[in-house]
Interface confidence: medium
């Protein structure tokens, strides 16, 4: 969880909503799944599937649940104590510092290079030069040599996995 909480992360709630459970803060903090009331006297539960809090806190609002983008699958839903966990669809990735959509992983390395890192939901395969061991720039090569025997590449009739 990021310690930085921005305004768009917050999901305003009606403090007096009758369906929300209340309890008293402990040393000024409310437990996971709750936020503190404006007067600091009550802990109010987050709304399941809408917002959450993961730690003991003194937040005035719970954090808004993430919605998975198209091209992503939901690994686990948002609950009152944990955010949604999303992942790029099979064989695609999105770098953490990039806001772009999930992109397809390459299926192999250019000639003269070997694969040292697998396709993951947040990184393309990693290639290094056979001789120097230096990393490839990441540009998709014009000619690719599919590495069928390495783990993490799409299975094919000639792969070890069968």
């Amino acid at each position: 969880e990021s310690a930085l909480i921005t305004q768009q992360d917050l999901a305003p709630q009606q403090r007096a909503a009758p369906q929300q459970k209340r309890s008293s803060p402990s040393e000024g903090l409310c437990p996971p799944g709750h936020h503190i009331s404006e007067d600091g006297r009550d802990c109010i539960s987050c709304k399941y599937g809408q917002d959450y809090s993961t730690h003991w806190n003194d937040l005035l609002f719970c954090l808004r649940c993430t919605r998975c983008d198209s091209g992503e699958v939901e690994l686990s839903p948002c609950t009152t104590t944990r955010n949604t966990v999303c992942q790029c669809e099979e064989g695609t990735f999105r770098e953490e510092d990039s806001p772009e959509m999930c992109r397809k992983c390459r299926t192999g390395c250019p000639r003269g290079m070997v694969k040292v890192g697998d396709c993951t939901p947040w990184s393309d395969i990693e290639c290094v030069h056979k001789e120097s061991g230096t990393k490839h720039s990441g540009e998709v090569p014009a000619v690719e040599e599919t590495v069928t025997s390495s783990p993490g590449t799409p299975a094919s009739p000639c792969s070890l996995s069968g």
Epitope: R82, V85, G91, P121, G152, A155
Partner: antibody, heavy 121, light 107 residues
Framework: EVQLVESGGGLVKPGGSLRLSCAAS????????MNWVRQAPGKGLEWVSS????????YYADSVKGRFTISRDNAKNSLYLQMNSLRAEDTAVYYC??????????????WGQGTLVTVSS | DIQMTQSPSSLSASVGDRVTITCRAS??????LNWYQQKPGKAPKLLIY???SLQSGVPSRFSDSGSGTDFTLTISSLQPEDFATYYC?????????FGPGTKVDIK
């Protein structure tokens, strides 16, 4: 109830082969990535191999690459580990473990009870 | 490969104590860290996944903090059933790697 039950462990000589099986029940097996994790006697946990829900993506630890093959049969709710060219250092309890509902493993849950593989002459 | 280290390797504590276990990755793994509990002769049990998501049924006394390379598992008030070995594991890059474990025993 979600359950994973391993079988196929036993005593084998160095250079020999074994095939481990894991029978899954209580969840939609075909939607989840699956894994094998092992633990040598008195030691810590070591990840062995993972397979995506559709079998399209397969990963192995360097220590078993080229010797072990993971596979699954979604119609039978079963996971397999074919172990060839076994070595003494492969001696361990082998656990079958569920993964996330995505193609790339991540966390391991639930776990089977484990099956002991002993490689000794 | 990403190496995972844990400290301490073992600790003795009493029921009611606040216990902290540290896990460090050899390179940034963002928040892709999971924690497991294992009791002797039993299979491991997932406690926390994706750094901060408490697995269903796990008591709220377990919590995780940190991101990047440094993570902490905290048990706010140790209970008798918490005496066990705890492992961290990164799922950022294959090969997935575990820490060597931290054994928590009775003082």
């Amino acid at each position: 109830e979600v359950q994973l039950v391993e079988s196929g462990g036993g005593l084998v000589k160095p250079g020999g082969s074994l095939r481990l099986s894991c029978a899954a029940s209580g969840f939609t097996f075909s939607s989840y990535s699956m894994n094998w994790v092992r633990q040598a006697p008195g030691k810590g946990l070591e990840w062995v191999s993972s397979i995506s829900s559709s079998s399209s993506y397969i990963y192995y630890a360097d220590s078993v690459k080229g010797r072990f093959t993971i596979s699954r049969d979604n119609a039978k709710n079963s996971l397999y580990l074919q172990m060839n060219s076994l070595r003494a250092e492969d001696t361990a309890v082998y656990y079958c473990a569920g993964g996330s509902s995505g193609w790339y493993g991540g966390w391991f849950d639930p776990w089977g009870q484990g099956t002991l593989v002993t490689v000794s002459s | 490969d990403i190496q995972m280290t844990q400290s301490p390797s073992s600790l003795s504590a009493s029921v009611g104590d606040r216990v902290t276990i540290t896990c460090r990755a050899s390179q940034s793994i963002s928040g892709y860290l999971n924690w497991y509990q294992q009791k002797p002769g039993k299979a491991p049990k997932l406690l926390i996944y994706a750094a901060s998501s408490l697995q269903s049924g796990v008591p709220s006394r377990f919590s995780d903090s940190g991101s990047g390379t440094d993570f902490t598992l905290t048990i706010s008030s140790l209970q008798p059933e918490d005496f066990a070995t705890y492992y961290c594991q990164q799922s950022y890059r294959t090969p997935f790697t575990f820490g060597p474990g931290t054994k928590v025993d009775i003082k």
